[in-house]
Interface confidence: medium
């Protein structure tokens, strides 16, 4: 079974995937297609690092550029450091500016929907 067939087989299960399971899959030899990735719960995708998303998508990571204005990719980009996004070489913009400190305050996020940033 090739990677595409593999994810067609399992994508119906993935919509409700918790972050922990996505992290586990990122540690294994998978290449999730973008259509499947876009169906994931936003709250499950947000905690994933750039490296984890890169490993989860494998060669399909290039497709993030085309989806950068759509959820969950848009919201995920907003949570990443720009210098981490730059390592993908895809020209993704909108990450946390280099030098800013992220305060992971749940109340702040609940009010504003975005992380609280402190300037350099």
């Amino acid at each position: 079974m090739n990677g595409s067939e593999y994810f067609v087989k399992i994508q119906s299960f993935l919509g409700g995937a918790p972050t922990e399971d996505l992290k586990a899959l990122s540690q294994q030899n998978v290449s999730m297609d973008l259509a499947t990735f876009m169906k994931l719960r936003t709250d499950a995708v947000l905690p994933l690092t750039v490296a984890e998303v890169q490993k989860l998508l494998g060669p399909h990571v290039e497709g993030l550029k085309a989806e950068e204005r759509h959820r969950p990719v848009r919201d995920w980009i907003l949570r990443q450091r720009q210098d981490d996004l730059d390592t993908l070489g895809l020209g993704l913009q909108g990450g946390i500016p280099n030098g800013y400190l992220v305060l992971d305050l749940s109340m702040q996020e609940a009010l504003s929907g975005t992380p609280c940033l402190l300037g350099p």
Epitope: M1, Y6, K9, I10, Q11, S12, F13, L14, G16, A17, D21, K23, A24, L25, Q27, Q28, N29, V30, P47, T49, A51, E52, K55
Partner: antibody
Framework: EVKFEESGGGLVQPGGSMKLSCVAS????????MNWVRQSPEKGLEWVAQ??????????HYAESVKGRFSISRDDSKSSVYLQMNNLRAEDTGIYYC???????WGQGTTLTVSS | DIVLTQSPASLALSPGKRATISCRAS??????????IHWFQQKPGQPPKLLIY???NLETGVPARFSGSGSRTDFTLTIDPVEEDDVAIYYC?????????FGGGTKLEIK
């Protein structure tokens, strides 16, 4: 090419301590969970400990048989993972392997013998 | 803990025959539809080598004589045809739940 260099095994008395090291190369070490797995004739292959990523605050997990005695750590700047073993018992004797992710690559193993 | 029961404990086959090794899990090893069972080959004096990941995916560089099948709790490693070089112990591993657990191993001998 993925490579591991394990060290630190040897003979130790019951109740003693030992620290194993594993230096990895050939992949982006900081992106992967690392594990220690041991093997003995009595117990076969036995997963021992796991350490996750910086983004997971280096979360650790242990087999029940080693909880409170063993401690796994990593130094991403050195592409290294360690296993500090205290209060060693005879049943800890075996070959200790470091492995990456879900076992895609393994080191050659280092032998620990706990005996008086 | 998830218990993996392998059978048979050993088997001896002539070259060209088919080897079938079973691994039964005490509960489902599926992560959102992905069966996280993996098969390893271990030859004397060597570390285990990954053959099959996610129940049925052939690791790069592993001969197509090796295949994996099954889902949820029942899995099979098949070697067809068996060759002299396949003499080894074969193990299954589940990475669904901590603690990760291995099967007891199946020793393959060639007649």
């Amino acid at each position: 090419e993925v490579k591991f260099e394990e060290s630190g095994g040897g003979l130790v008395q019951p109740g003693g301590s030992m620290k194993l090291s594993c230096v990895a190369s050939g992949f982006t070490f900081s992106n992967y969970w690392m594990n220690w797995v041991r093997q003995s004739p009595e117990k076969g292959l036995e997963w021992v400990a796991q350490i996750r990523l910086k983004s997971d605050n280096y979360a650790t997990h242990y087999a029940e048989s080693v909880k409170g005695r063993f401690s796994i750590s990593r130094d991403d700047s050195k592409s290294s993972v360690y296993l500090q073993m205290n209060n060693l018992r005879a049943e800890d004797t075996g070959i200790y392997y470091c492995s990456v992710g879900t076992g895609g690559y393994w080191g050659q193993g280092t032998t620990l013998t706990v005996s008086s | 803990d998830i218990v993996l029961t392998q059978s048979p404990a050993s088997l001896a086959l002539s070259p060209g025959k088919r080897a079938t090794i079973s691994c039964r899990a005490s509960e489902s090893v599926s992560i959102i539809g992905t069966d996280v069972i993996h098969w390893f080959q271990q030859k004397p004096g060597q570390p285990p080598k990954l053959l099959i990941y996610h129940a049925s995916n052939l690791e790069t560089g592993v001969p197509a004589r090796f295949s994996g099948s099954g889902s949820r709790t029942d899995f099979t490693l098949t070697i067809d045809p068996v060759e002299e070089d396949d003499v080894a112990i074969y193990y299954c591993l589940q990475s669904r739940k901590i603690p990760w657990t291995f099967g007891g191993g199946t020793k393959l001998e060639i007649k």
